[in-house]
């Protein structure tokens, strides 16, 4: 187990002519965020294929507004690292996609809008525990500078995070054949308990007795290199003329999966889908109870208190299989409607909605009066592709949810005093004025500029404005 860390140093115009226009403007201020997607191996995979090693989304960067006439500078970046935790061994070779997203902060109805500014991709070799590797990638006229590294989480150490460290049993030195764990010099390597003969360079194990191969190696002891060149025959003996090394039988030939497991080939070797009650690389581990921790990827184990009763793994979002061992590509379902963008955050699926839409799947049209009610007796008014609420007296805000102060606008003229009232406001007029808002002077001869006041209402009495 460990963490892949990505530090973005700068994102801005690349060298050479044709500098890109600033993605933000005074009218449409914006900010950036980044998404990284990691896949094991060096395969040329489509951008849409699942991020099998994991993915991460950065925080939003500071808001940026373009200075008119100025060229687009390096844009302000989010703070902090992007971190992608990995549960299994670090594969040593990996593919990455780094996307730069723009969040527009204009006054669109329904909040901000997102658009992809740039996408860079690459394939790299990287040992865990090594120093930061620096990189520069270009996408069109944009340039992205970044560093990355993979580090192991204790107690794992080594270039693949497969060796384990344990506190020393003796104060001075480690046991026979065991080295101190750099950089944790007060700890010692735990003895490896992989299958006898498992290649120490190309194999690793996560459970006693198994031998799992790193990228590029196969065979029961991970001693057979997998060909990376293209061969005429998909299987068969190695060809001396092409220098092509291909394992003879296919990885699923003879079905290596025990206990009724079904075998499927993978780019790296094979994968067993085990029936409930069995797990392990070849479904060889049986009599499993919840105490054995059979549920992977944070799955919750239920039942199975004894070997005869079956357990059930309740998988977290993004995983499936009887042991939560399979990652689901949930964005392939295309759950986001109305042009929303699907982001698989690992633990959750998020739709980034276009302006004017909202909801878990962007199903809610904010521009549509039919899909939005105005509170407290307000009425919805459509116009120009947007909606607004015309609020009843005493209420305000986008949805008429806020209680408005009817006196805030100082509606009483000529020094009249305003009083809020459940049905509106009341003006108490200064001497010499009358009317609902004290707008009419009382004539010196006693006649007013208004029609005669209703019986019982003297000039200067409070006038209720309804």
């Amino acid at each position: 187990a460990g963490v892949f860390e990505l530090q973005i140093h700068s994102f801005g115009p690349g060298p050479g002519p044709g500098a890109p226009r600033s993605p933000c403007s005074a009218r449409l201020p914006c900010r950036l965020f980044f998404r990284v997607c990691l896949k094991p191996g060096l395969s040329e995979e489509a951008a849409e294929s699942p991020c099998a090693l994991g993915a991460a989304l950065s925080a939003r960067g500071p808001v940026y507004t373009e200075q008119p006439g100025a060229p687009a500078p390096d844009l302000p970046l989010p703070d902090g690292l992007l971190q992608v935790p990995f549960r299994d061994a670090w594969p040593g070779t990996f593919s990455f996609i780094i996307e730069t997203w723009r969040e527009e902060l204009g006054d669109q109805i329904g909040g901000p809008a997102w658009s992809l500014l740039a996408r860079v991709a690459g394939r790299r070799r990287l040992a865990a525990g090594g120093p930061w590797a620096r990189d520069i990638q270009r996408a069109g006229a944009w340039e992205l500078r970044f560093s990355y590294r993979a580090r192991c989480e204790p107690p794992a150490v080594g270039t693949a995070c497969t060796r384990l460290c344990r506190p020393r049993s003796a104060p001075s030195r480690c046991g026979p054949g065991l080295r101190p764990c750099a950089p944790l010099e007060d700890e010692c390597e735990a003895p490896l308990v992989c299958r006898a003969g498992c290649s120490p360079e190309h194999g690793f194990c996560e459970q006693p007795g198994e031998c799992r191969c790193l990228e590029g190696w196969t065979g029961p002891l991970c001693t057979v290199p997998v060909s990376t060149s293209s061969c005429l025959s998909p299987r068969g003996p190695s060809s001396a003329t092409t220098g092509c090394l291909v394992p003879g039988p296919g990885p699923c030939d003879g079905n290596p999966c025990a206990n009724g497991g079904s075998c499927s080939e993978t780019p790296r070797s094979f994968e067993c889908t085990c029936p409930r009650g069995f797990y392990g690389l070849r479904c060889e581990v049986s009599g499993v109870t919840c105490a054995d921790g059979p549920c992977f990827n944070g799955g919750l184990c239920v039942g199975g208190a004894d070997p005869d009763s079956a357990y059930i793994c309740h998988c977290p979002p993004g995983f499936q299989g009887s042991n939560c061992e399979k990652r689901v590509d949930r964005c392939s379902l295309q759950p986001c409607r109305n042009g929303g963008l699907c982001l698989d955050l690992g633990h959750a699926l998020r739709c980034r909605c276009r302006a004017g839409f909202a909801g878990p799947r962007c199903e809610h049209d904010l521009d549509d009066c039919a899909g939005r009610a105005c509170a407290n007796g307000g009425t919805c008014v459509e116009g120009g592709g947007a909606h607004r609420c015309s609020c009843a007296l005493g209420f305000g805000g986008r949805d008429c949810r806020e209680r408005a102060d009817p006196c805030a606008a100082r509606p009483c003229a000529h020094g009249g005093r305003c009083y809020a009232h459940f049905s509106g406001l009341v003006c108490a007029c200064a001497p010499g004025y009358m009317g609902a808002r004290c707008e009419f002077p009382v004539h010196p001869d006693g006649a007013s500029a208004l029609p005669a006041a209703p019986p019982g209402l003297r000039p200067g009495d409070p006038q209720r404005y309804l």
Partner: antibody
Framework: EVQLQQSGAELVRPGALVKLSCKAS????????IHWVKQRPELGLEWIGW????????IYDPKFQDKASITADTSSNTAYLHLSSLTSEGTAVYYC???????????WGQGTLVTVSS | DIVMSQSPSSLAVSVGEKVTMRCKSS????????????LAWYQQKPGQSPKLLIY???TRESGVPDRFTGSGSGTDFTLTISSVKAEDLAVYFC????????FGGGTKLEIK
């Protein structure tokens, strides 16, 4: 482990206001929408509305538009349901539930019983 | 608003029997772009919160026994329990998440 922990039972007078809370743990609060659902005996489940904690946007069933207000506090990973002008029809169990783009109401709180009585 | 109707409102069966309950929506829940039905089924046992069983009309939630099957498309949907167990005693609700959210009135499953 994902959990939605709701506040305790409430006994309120008719016409009063009540504020129910729903504290999320075990997941990134901002990545999920939080819904509120009302359940009265023999009357099934009624959806009140949702909030997106990332931006505070809330949408309501028009039937609850004047009665309910949903807010969220991302610093404490808590969503709130404010109910106003309560009548005897407000007596119910109120549930919060979380939803992302893939799963509908995958996780539910344990429910809060609100009793409106004079 | 989309109205959800469930039938029957209650039914009593013996352990081991097959059960079918229906849910009908007042408008189609099928989204043409992804050919998915925005419908879920929930189980609510006495004194408990509802629990998600089926989503996208036919996808079984992780950990839900395979005796539960969701089917249907458009406006007509079915939840089938192939062989009822005593622990299946509950009320079953359908819910649309195509627009706003609305639940059916529920089907109460009792064990004879």
């Amino acid at each position: 482990e994902v959990q939605l922990q709701q506040s305790g039972a409430e006994l309120v007078r008719p016409g009063a206001l009540v504020k129910l809370s729903c504290k999320a743990s075990g997941f990134n609060f901002k990545d999920y929408y939080i819904h509120w659902v009302k359940q009265r005996p023999e009357l099934g489940l009624e959806w009140i509305g949702w909030i997106d904690p990332e931006n505070g946007n809330a949408i309501y069933d028009p039937k609850f538009q004047d009665k309910a207000s949903i807010t969220a506090d991302t610093s404490s990973n808590t969503a709130y349901l404010h109910l106003s002008s309560l009548t005897s029809e407000g007596t119910a169990v109120y549930y919060c539930a979380s939803e992302d783009a893939y799963y509908p109401f995958a996780y539910w709180g344990q429910g809060t019983l609100v009793t409106v009585s004079s | 608003d989309i109205v959800m109707s469930q039938s029957p409102s209650s039914l009593a069966v013996s352990v081991g029997e097959k059960v079918t309950m229906r849910c009908k929506s007042s408008q189609s829940l099928l989204y043409s772009s992804n050919q998915k039905n925005y419908l879920a089924w929930y189980q609510q046992k006495p004194g408990q919160s509802p629990k998600l069983l089926i989503y996208w009309a036919s996808t079984r939630e992780s950990g839900v026994p395979d005796r539960f099957t969701g089917s249907g498309s458009g406006t007509d949907f079915t939840l089938t329990i192939s062989s009822v167990k005593a622990e299946d005693l509950a009320v079953y609700f359908c819910q649309q998440y195509y627009s706003y959210r609305t639940f059916g009135g529920g089907t109460k499953l009792e064990i004879k």
